[in-house]
Interface confidence: low
């Protein structure tokens, strides 16, 4: 994939040279007036009748450095007894992200987006039970 | 947060020009083999017991231009009869991602990197009942 | 949970010395360059030193060379800061910063420890 600015308001711009030298701003704001990083985790992820757990993914050439992956603790669904219920599934609710990864060894200092995919949480689905021909 | 150039690493890099004028490659690169992009978006927003919808939102100055929202459909959890079960609470699981914008009428383009936080899908979550003193 | 706790500042003469210190934990410590930060009164962050993952590269603002030196042991996830030759300019709250890449987002910080130099 890749990102193609509108040429046209800028009419000199070459597509190659824009895709590898645009410069960006890495000051990273918040389109949301609250410090998000400093959001204290949910624990729905205890609570849940699909529960998850999370695992840390870190990277040093990589912004955000540490990201947390979900994964599902049980391929069933908790019920109300707490016992697991073989009539539903926990799934695994993906999001397709953008990452920064440092080009190896540039100077002055270049980095390149990449698309990462990862589980968030989890949520519970009735079992899809196929019927025989 | 604050951000502080490790102006160092490159000599002769000035902390003012470092942060607004980095090079990135915008090539996206997926870190995984497949295609992400192209995958199928899951049904599991419709059979989920805490069912949810996708909005749209777009901007044609940021990367990606399309992000779609969750939002929850019900306040409660759907019961295995269809029902919606008041014991239970369906959740936003929101996800803390980079976007990238582009800094307005900038000629050539430049982008500046920002945090937003979006929802992803829901879960169903028991609810909590607090007792009285 | 990530966790720097900064110790050692107070105050100093002229010329004196002080060595701060930062214990960190939460993290893969020996995984990250580290930096200490400063601020002085009504004024905005300055970045002091940079230390590498391994210890071998050090960097420092043009105002400390010479007079500052930072260290770190991987083994005891710490961080230090040797200051020597204090002047009055370097009176500032000290911080110690986890480095994700550059630039450095500083999500994570101490409390900071304040280093007067005054007669």
């Known amino acids: 994939a890749a990102i193609i600015p509108q040429s046209s308001a800028c009419p000199n711009t070459e597509a190659k040279d824009f895709l590898q030298n645009v410069k960006v701003n890495l000051k990273v704001f918040n389109s949301l007036g609250a410090k998000v990083s400093s959001r204290r985790p949910s624990d729905y992820l205890n609570r849940s009748t699909s529960p998850w757990t999370l695992h840390r993914n870190e990277d040093p050439d990589r912004y955000p450095s540490v990201i947390w992956e979900a994964q599902c603790r049980h391929q069933r669904c908790v019920n109300a007894e707490g016992k697991l219920d073989h009539h539903m599934n926990s799934v695994l609710i993906q999001q397709e992200i953008l990452v920064l990864k440092r080009e190896p060894e540039s100077c002055p200092f270049t980095f390149r987006v990449e698309k990462m995919l990862v589980g968030v949480g989890c949520t519970c689905v009735a079992s899809i039970v196929r019927q025989a021909a | 947060a604050a951000i502080i150039p490790q102006s160092s690493a490159c000599p002769n890099t000035e902390a003012k020009d470092f942060l607004q004028n980095v090079k990135v490659n915008l090539k996206v690169f997926n870190s995984l083999g497949a295609k992400v992009s192209s995958r199928r978006p899951s049904d599991y927003l419709n059979r989920s017991t805490s069912p949810w919808t996708l909005h749209r939102n777009e901007d044609p100055d940021r990367y990606p231009s399309v992000i779609w929202e969750a939002q929850c459909r019900h306040q409660r959890c759907v019961n295995a009869e269809g029902k919606l079960d008041h014991h239970m609470n369906s959740v936003l699981i929101q996800q803390e991602i980079l976007v990238l914008k582009r800094e307005p009428e900038s000629c050539p383009f430049t982008f500046r990197v920002e945090k937003m936080l979006v929802g992803v899908g829901c879960t169903c979550v028991a609810s909590i009942v607090r007792q009285a003193a | 949970e990530v966790q720097l706790v900064e110790s050692g500042g107070g105050l100093v003469q002229p010329g004196g010395s002080l060595r701060l210190s930062c214990a960190a934990s939460?993290?893969?410590?020996?995984?990250?360059?580290m930096y200490w930060v400063r601020q002085a009164p009504g004024k905005g962050l300055e970045w002091v030193a940079e230390?590498?993952?391994?210890?071998?590269?050090?960097y420092y603002v043009d105002s400390v060379k010479g007079r500052f030196t930072i260290s770190r042991d991987n083994a005891k996830n710490s961080l230090y800061l040797q200051m020597n030759s204090l002047r009055a300019e370097d009176t500032a709250v000290y911080y110690c910063?986890?480095?994700?890449?550059?630039?450095?987002?500083?999500?994570?910080w101490g409390q900071g420890t304040l280093v007067t130099v005054s007669s």
């Open positions: 939460g993290f893969t410590f020996s995984s990250y360059s």
């Open positions: 910063a986890k480095g994700e890449i550059l630039p450095l987002y500083f999500d994570y």
């Open positions: 230390i590498r993952q391994d210890g071998s590269e050090q």
